[in-house]
């Protein structure tokens, strides 16, 4: 009997640190998103980046989903938000349009039960960037705790898409689960 | 037999405890690094900074290793990685090399096995730093979540490091493990 | 007995599992914290803030406690700290008092038991808001990991808090739990 | 690609300008580096430059060697009151992304002869 | 100041050769490796103290960090015969010479 009560007691608790394993990573989506160079829009007015890699480089995704642009929340909960975006402009690339620039970024939640769009975090500067100088660059980064809900979704808008900086290290988002919904 | 498996469960039970709040610490390694004051370079080159604190007023480390410059991963896993990086000039120092500046910082990743260096975050700004100010000031901070592997190697690299603030709230990096790798 | 023991066990495990559960939320507190705009000081000196918002919009508080513009630590932890400061002028506020301007924050500890203050993050910049643009922007993001005790206060100071943008979206601070002292 | 020139026989206490001319790069976040090295010697840095950073130079070149951008595609080495001692063949370099230790554009090098 | 050693070394067709190079202070991992054959421009081979430069061979290695650092030339064939250099690239406070005095390579 005893020996008996020991082995169930072992398997049991061999399932529970499967079953505290498996919790522990479940309850942890993040996602680390950068910016895909090849579909940078144009112009100067806010637009919303809708193509980011999820999956090359330092890019990666795991229990959230990427879809047309959004970064959609699959498990509820609370979660460190976060994006760096960089701009950059080179003499080389022609004159720019104006030299004083808006050069800003704003993380917005979209809910499908309710269409609407709410900023959660807005960065930037005014730059003034003259002639004077054959380079400029600036850099943006926010971050914030926030609930979110299964379906949410996560985006980014920025002004002036044209000089944002393809590389991996340079425009990026993302998110990670810190914590339950009490 | 009762009072028996009672007192053996309530003794695994303990030991389960013990081993969960070991592992759960042991899971999460941290390190908060402020820069070392007596050793910042001068010059405006690009450049691997070396010298930082690991044990004094708000810099500490917990199961990851910081030598010659360069935060050791000790430990597998999804990290959070932050830098906030200051730079000043004030008129008392002397005059600039130029007015024109990219101050800049990259927060890379090296692995001993394959000798290579990679940029997981940058950011910056391009600043024209005038004689008509006395003092000048510019902070950069940058974050974000990556997978980091036993053996791997994060250091901070930045341009203009002569002008560096050496205060350990103005000029610091760290990490934090989040979860571990599935 | 054996069916005893069992329905002991599932019990046993049950609170166990109440335990975990609770335990990891309560070891978790956390505070996302927005300003006031309703109390912003005039002027351009640094100051403290002590108007934030913990109840509505993304504003938030969970074992945590905020009190005369302070948010007080409950429970022995390390922390991630962060801030964002978004200062803003539009010429139809009428002209600034100089257009060469210091924008700055510092997230400070206050500790009761030694009344002393100290500065865990700066960052900020020198601008120079020149008459020709209508309109100026510029934020600022910090954040940190931090040991913190309980009874410990973290405080915000900024320098021209006349300039402060008073959306929910631009300027807040926060902290969360990520682990246990040793 | 880099290239020195104005490498000359000169008398001591001349002044001579030597001018390093780049192409497929700029100085917006490359750096131009000068070295020497003496017949039969090792290599000498004597300084760099680029545009976000300004110059910077070896102690003992300080006074009398000025290091200066003088176009979008040329940096001149500016020396005075030079000496026997500054008999050497002068090459210019780039220092990729500005990091000093990668110097990885070399040109072939113009001799400078200081002789009375 | 960096100190190179030894002044000169020779080694066989096959066989392996190590320079070392020594930092007065630390100068973390900003070290820099160029091999210079007589009546050329110096060659990039290591940079970062053990990142190889594109297009070099990985029969070189560079290794260490904060003031000791070695360079490893293994298999070592004829065309290896040259000087090799060290820098740094850290500081340009009270620099003499940014790079040491150089070790000569003689393949037998």
């Known amino acids: 009997g005893s020996q008996h009560i020991r082995a169930e007691k072992a398997m049991v608790d061999g399932s529970w640190l499967d079953l505290a394993k498996r919790s522990k990573l479940e309850a942890q989506p993040f996602a680390h998103l950068t910016i895909n160079a090849t579909d940078i829009p144009s112009g100067s007015h806010k637009v919303s980046l809708s193509s980011w890699y999820h999956d090359r480089g330092w890019a990666k995704i795991s229990n959230m989903t990427f879809s047309n642009g959004k970064l959609i929340v699959n498990q509820d909960g609370f979660y460190y938000l976060y994006a760096n975006i960089c701009f950059r402009h080179h003499e080389t690339s022609g004159d720019l349009a104006t030299e004083y620039l808006q050069l800003m970024v704003y993380v917005t939640k979209t809910s499908i039960k309710i269409p609407s769009s709410h900023t959660l975090m807005k960065g930037g500067s005014t730059k003034y960037w003259s002639g004077n100088s054959e380079f400029h660059f600036y850099s943006i980064n926010v971050g914030g705790f926030f609930k979110l809900r299964s379906g949410e979704e996560i985006s980014i808008e920025v002004s002036n898409p044209s000089l944002l900086d393809p590389d991996q290290d340079a425009t990026y988002f993302g998110a990670f689960k810190v914590r339950d919904i009490d | 037999g009762s009072q028996h498996i009672r007192a053996e469960k309530a003794m695994v039970d303990g030991s389960w405890l013990d081993l969960a709040k070991r592992s759960k610490l042991e899971a999460q390694p941290f390190a908060h690094l402020t820069i070392n004051a007596t050793d910042i370079p001068s010059g405006s080159h690009k450049v691997s900074l070396s010298s930082w604190y690991h044990d004094r007023g708000w810099a500490k480390i917990s199961n990851m290793t910081f030598s010659n410059g360069k935060l050791i991963v000790n430990q597998d896993g999804f990290y959070y990685l932050y830098a906030n990086i200051c730079f000043r000039h004030h008129e008392t120092s002397g005059d600039l090399a130029t007015e024109y500046l990219q101050l800049m910082v990259y927060v890379t990743k090296t692995s001993i096995k394959i000798p290579s260096s990679h940029t997981l975050m940058k950011g910056g700004s391009t600043k024209y730093w005038s004689g008509n100010s006395e003092f000048h000031f510019y902070s950069i901070n940058v974050g974000g979540f990556f997978k980091l592997r036993s053996g791997e190697e994060i250091s901070i690299e930045v341009s203009n490091p002569s002008l560096l603030d050496p205060d350990q709230d103005a000029t610091y990096f760290g990490a934090f493990k989040v979860r571990d790798i599935d | 007995g054996s069916q005893h023991i069992r329905a002991e066990k599932a019990m046993v495990d049950g609170s166990w599992l109440d335990l975990a559960k609770r335990s990891k939320l309560e070891a978790q507190p956390f505070a996302h914290l927005t300003i006031n705009a309703t109390d912003i000081p005039s002027g351009s000196h640094k100051v403290s803030l002590s108007s934030w918002y913990h109840d509505r919009g993304w504003a938030k508080i969970s074992n945590m406690t905020f009190s005369n513009g302070k948010l007080i630590v409950n429970q022995d932890g390390f922390y991630y700290l962060y801030a964002n400061i978004c200062f803003r002028h539009h010429e139809t506020s009428g002209d600034l008092a100089t257009e060469y301007l210091q924008l700055m924050v510092y997230v400070t500890k206050t500790s009761i038991k030694i009344p002393s203050s100290h500065t865990l993050m700066k960052g900020g910049s020198t601008k120079y808001w020149s008459g020709n643009s209508e309109f100026h922007f510029y934020s600022i993001n910090v954040g940190g990991f931090f040991k913190l005790r309980s009874g410990e206060e973290i405080s915000i100071e900024v320098s021209n808090p006349s300039l402060l943008d008073p959306d929910q979206d631009a300027t807040y601070f926060g902290a969360f739990k990520v682990r246990d002292i040793d | 690609s880099v290239e020195e020139s104005g490498g000359r026989l000169v008398t001591p206490g001349t002044p001579l300008t030597l001018t390093c001319t780049f192409s497929g790069f700029s100085l917006s976040n490359n750096a131009i580096n000068w070295v020497r090295q003496a017949p039969g010697k090792g290599l000498e840095w004597i300084g760099y430059?680029?545009?976000?950073?300004?110059t910077y130079c070896a102690s003992w070149a300080k006074g009398r060697f000025t290091i200066s951008k003088t176009s979008s595609t040329t940096v001149d080495l500016k020396m005075t009151s030079l000496t026997t001692e500054d008999t050497a063949t002068y090459f210019c370099a780039r220092a990729y992304d500005s990091e000093w230790d990668r110097l990885d554009l070399w040109g072939q090098g113009t001799l400078v002869t200081v002789s009375s | 100041v960096m100190t190179q050693t030894p002044a000169s070394v020779s080694g066989p067709v096959g066989g392996t050769v190590t320079i070392k190079c020594q930092a007065s202070q630390s100068i973390g991992s900003n070290l820099g490796w160029y091999q210079q054959k007589p009546g050329q421009p110096p060659k990039l081979l290591i940079f970062s103290a053990s990142n190889l430069e594109s297009g070099v061979p990985s029969r070189f290695k560079g290794s260490g960090s904060g003031t000791q650092f070695t360079l490893t030339i293994s298999d070592l064939e004829c065309d290896d015969a040259a000087t090799y250099y060290c820098q740094q690239g850290y500081t340009t406070n009270n620099v003499l010479n940014a790079f040491a005095g150089g070790t000569e390579v003689v393949v037998k």
């Open positions: 430059t680029w545009s976000g950073g300004g």
